[in-house]
């Protein structure tokens, strides 16, 4: 946890972040909750970035006040304002932008004091892979597909049957640069499996992680798929 | 560690023109604004310029507007002041600063000197 | 054009000393206001962001207060690196500075 200062004669209030990342052209969540004031015109919600010359977005009382926003945040901010009044002042960011990466400051200004704290906020594309069988190739191929992910992320393969063994030989890789020039679609292609084996597709980069699981027996095809966001931790 | 290094300072005649620079590591330079303060001989300090980060919004003291032109060239990470039609008033030391929190400025260069003389 | 107006112009203190320092803005700034210290010869230092933020690795004597258009800059406890120049400066409408406070030794 991170206190904020008491200034001004005003005592110091808990405010709390979530380091998070923004998966661009989607909506994300910059999280922030403070303790909770019992009036809501009394409650400031003051949102920085560093570097950025104007707010990112300012709450008092109990609307939005824009006339200090920076421009580059213009029209894609909102704070949940029902929830204010239970202490949440957690911002949604429209259409995440590559440039919206950086260090944010949540800084609450209540009856009770002030306080603030800090958020380091990511940005760049990530997705769920899915993996198939590819009927097409000469011998048993899997396809791992990934339509959006920046920067360019590391594919490594897996196997339950032989744990801990090195399918890079055995594999093929490719990123396809998507049309706004920015995320790349991920594809990659494991030769020689077997059956009766799962095998996983781990994409990563220093955002997210995500996994596309597939069982391939005599009888049946079993895919799963999972997406984990790395570094979120409170402060 | 951040820094910045400005050059291009020197003895130019008035009417004249100097183009200064300031070399920016240590930070994502794109994500950040920069500005141009100066302080003349035994003087206070005076804002001249500001950039955003993209470079896409710039401002300019009264004092200066229309003689000198901020820009940036993020693929460099560096910052520039353009300066024309100089007057001996403009003699000063000039600064680049890095915006930090809430439009106040972090992280300052050394300065260099701009002199303007017959 | 927002002016700002420091005082006094120079100050007279001792180490140990609690000293302040004013700065009043023409117009309402709200609290984008933000201190710096300046040696001879050197660059300004950012102290006070904000109007009473300190900024990461400023002693913690230093503090800010104020709103609108009456700000303060306070030294609890005067040390002997902190005898300098102090500046305030708006960040409010475009920049402005005010036309500094010398602390020297009484």
């Known amino acids: 946890l991170i206190i904020g200062f008491g200034i001004s004669g005003r005592h110091s209030i808990t405010v709390t972040t979530v380091a998070s990342a923004g998966n661009i052209g989607e909506d994300g969540i910059l999280s922030c909750t403070f303790e909770p004031d019992i009036k809501l015109s009394d409650i400031v919600i003051q949102w920085l970035k560093e570097g950025v010359l104007g707010l990112v977005h300012e709450f008092k009382e109990g609307k939005d006040e824009l006339s200090e926003q920076d421009e580059m945040f213009r029209g894609r901010t909102a704070v949940f304002a029902d929830q204010v009044i239970v202490g949440n002042a957690s911002l949604r960011l429209k259409n995440v932008q590559l440039t919206d990466a950086g260090t944010y400051k949540c800084y609450i200004i209540t009856s009770k004091g002030k306080g603030n704290a800090n958020l380091e906020y990511k940005t760049g594309a990530f997705s769920m892979p899915e993996v198939n069988v590819d009927y097409n190739a000469s011998s048993e191929t899997l396809r791992c597909e990934a339509p959006r992910w920046f920067p360019q992320p590391t594919v490594v393969w897996a196997s339950q049957v032989d744990q801990g063994a090195n399918f890079s030989e055995v594999s093929n890789t490719s990123f396809e640069l998507n049309s706004e020039n920015v995320t790349m679609k991920v594809v990659s292609v494991l030769y020689n499996v077997t059956i009766n084996n799962t095998y996983s597709c781990m994409i990563e980069n220093d955002i997210a992680k995500a996994t596309g699981d597939i069982k391939v027996t005599e009888s049946e095809i079993k895919r799963r798929s999972h997406l984990q966001l790395l570094n979120s931790k409170a402060s | 560690e951040v820094q910045l290094l400005e050059s291009g300072g020197g003895l130019v005649q008035p009417g004249g023109s100097l183009r200064l620079s300031c070399a920016a590591s240590g930070f994502t330079f794109s994500s950040y604004a920069m500005k141009w303060v100066r302080q003349a001989p035994g003087k206070g300090l005076e804002w001249v310029s500001t950039t955003s980060g993209s470079g896409g919004t710039t401002y300019y003291a009264d004092s200066v507007k229309g003689r000198f032109t901020i820009s940036r060239d993020n693929s460099k990470n560096t910052l520039y002041l353009q300066m024309n039609s100089l007057r001996a008033e403009d003699t000063a030391v000039y600064y680049c600063a890095k915006a930090g929190w809430a439009a106040a400025f972090d992280y300052w260069g050394q300065g260099t000197l701009v002199t303007v003389s017959s | 054009d927002i002016q700002l107006t420091q005082f006094p112009s120079t100050l007279s203190a001792s180490v140990g000393d609690r000293i302040t320092i004013t700065c009043r803005a023409s117009q309402s700034i709200s609290d984008w206001l933000a201190w710096y210290q300046q040696k001879p010869g050197k660059a300004p230092k950012l102290l006070i962001y904000?109007?009473?933020s300190l900024e990461s690795g400023v002693p913690s004597r230093f503090s800010g207060s104020g709103s609108g258009t009456e700000f303060t800059l306070t030294i609890s406890s005067l040390q002997p690196d902190d005898f300098a120049t102090y500046y305030c400066q708006q960040c409010n409408s475009y920049w402005t500075f005010g036309q500094g406070t010398k602390v020297e030794i009484k």
């Open positions: 904000k109007a009473s």
